[in-house]
Interface confidence: medium
């Protein structure tokens, strides 16, 4: 599934991510377009032989199991191919276990490099909340 | 246990399209990726590519681009590797495998035939 | 793409001799590489994974060695269900490759 922008806003703070780990809803959504263009069964292959799944490009090597990912830590405990469905409980679920991790929303490249320190909140802007 | 059975041996004309089936069993169908593997006499095996059956995921080799597609029926846990405008280079056996970075899992394979 | 050379490609031995095969990559592949067996008209069978991982069920004189990108795999006591073509194949990055093979046959 393809989510629009408010649709996905509304998604996730149905599902607990507003100010998440002093994260506000727009970093969130900032962050799934910028992994994933909003699209729930993005998949990404990384040079170590890992790959990413879903909305927010969950990573097999240390949160997911996907059979084939060399040391994986399945720290969501959960087949990678969860993160894919359109329903994306499983990818909030493990999302809220990898911002607690430590690094924050520091672990999403595509944050770390397109969101953070810009105005996220126009990102849920105009959205009925 | 684990078994991939793979469709039976086909005879194609140049030109034509054939569609190979892998039916998987014993394990979660839609959560590991089905890879498929060209063998030919003297040029060895050959990675096409890849399907992740649960969402439908693929990646082809550069190679294959155009040449293979691949679907999957997570209802009858069966994937399939469609091979079109067939030429007699495509003349082959064609397995599928279950693809855990390396393949404990292989089916018996489908040998293709291409000849006028 | 990565290249993988086997050497040599054809290897002559009586039952009961050791040898050694040699799986080459073009670049670095850390420990990212598995060996198979084929015989004639069947479907390769996994024997080692991740260059030293015994398999399952694979008996003990088959055993695999190295790291980046030289590897070996040594067959302890040749028996003569043995015989037939081993492949490597890397798992390091896509497209994943294959080895041209080595066939161990009877002297």
């Known amino acids: 599934k393809v989510f629009g922008r408010c649709e996905l806003a509304a998604a996730m703070k149905r599902h607990g991510l507003d100010n998440y780990r002093g994260y506000s809803l727009g970093n969130w959504v900032c962050a799934a377009k910028f992994e994933s263009n909003f699209n729930t069964q993005a998949t990404n292959r990384n040079t170590d032989g890992s790959t990413d799944y879903g909305i927010l490009q969950i990573n097999s090597r240390w949160w997911c199991n996907d059979g084939r990912t060399p040391g994986s830590r399945n720290l969501c405990n959960i087949p990678c191919s969860a993160l894919l469905s359109s329903d994306i409980t499983a990818s909030v679920n493990c999302a809220k276990k990898i911002v607690s991790d430590g690094n924050g929303m520091n672990a999403w490249v595509a944050w770390r490099n397109r969101c953070k320190g810009t105005d996220v909140q126009a990102w849920i802007r105009g959205c009925r909340l | 246990q684990v078994q991939l059975q793979e469709s039976g041996a086909e005879v194609m004309k140049p030109g034509a399209s054939v569609k190979i089936s892998c039916k998987a069993t014993?394990?979660?169908?839609?959560?590991?990726?089905i890879e498929w593997v060209k063998q030919r006499p003297g040029h060895g095996l050959e990675w096409i590519g890849e399907?992740?059956?649960?969402?439908?995921?693929?990646y082809y080799n550069e190679k294959f681009k155009g040449k293979a597609t691949f679907t999957a029926d997570t209802s009858s846990n069966t994937a399939y590797m469609q091979l079109s405008s067939l030429t007699s280079e495509d003349s082959a056996v064609y397995y599928c495998?279950?693809?855990?970075?390396?393949?404990?899992?292989w089916g018996q394979g489908t040998t293709l035939t291409v000849s006028s | 793409d990565i290249e993988l050379t086997q050497s040599p490609a054809t290897l002559s031995v009586t039952p009961g001799d050791s040898v050694s095969l040699s799986c080459r990559a073009s670049q670095s592949i850390s420990n990212n590489l598995h060996w198979y067996q084929q015989k004639s008209h069947e479907s390769p069978r996994l024997l080692i994974k991740?260059?030293?991982q015994r398999v399952s069920g694979i008996p003990s004189r088959f055993s695999g060695s190295g790291s980046g990108t030289d590897f070996t795999l040594s067959i302890n006591s040749v028996e003569t269900e043995d015989f037939g073509m081993y492949f490597c194949q890397q798992s390091n990055s896509w497209p994943r490759t294959f080895g041209g093979g080595t066939k161990l046959e009877i002297k």
């Open positions: 399907i992740l059956p649960g969402s439908g995921s693929t």
């Open positions: 991740y260059a030293s």
């Open positions: 495998a279950r693809g855990d970075g390396w393949y404990c899992y």
């Open positions: 014993g394990y979660t169908f839609s959560t590991y990726w």
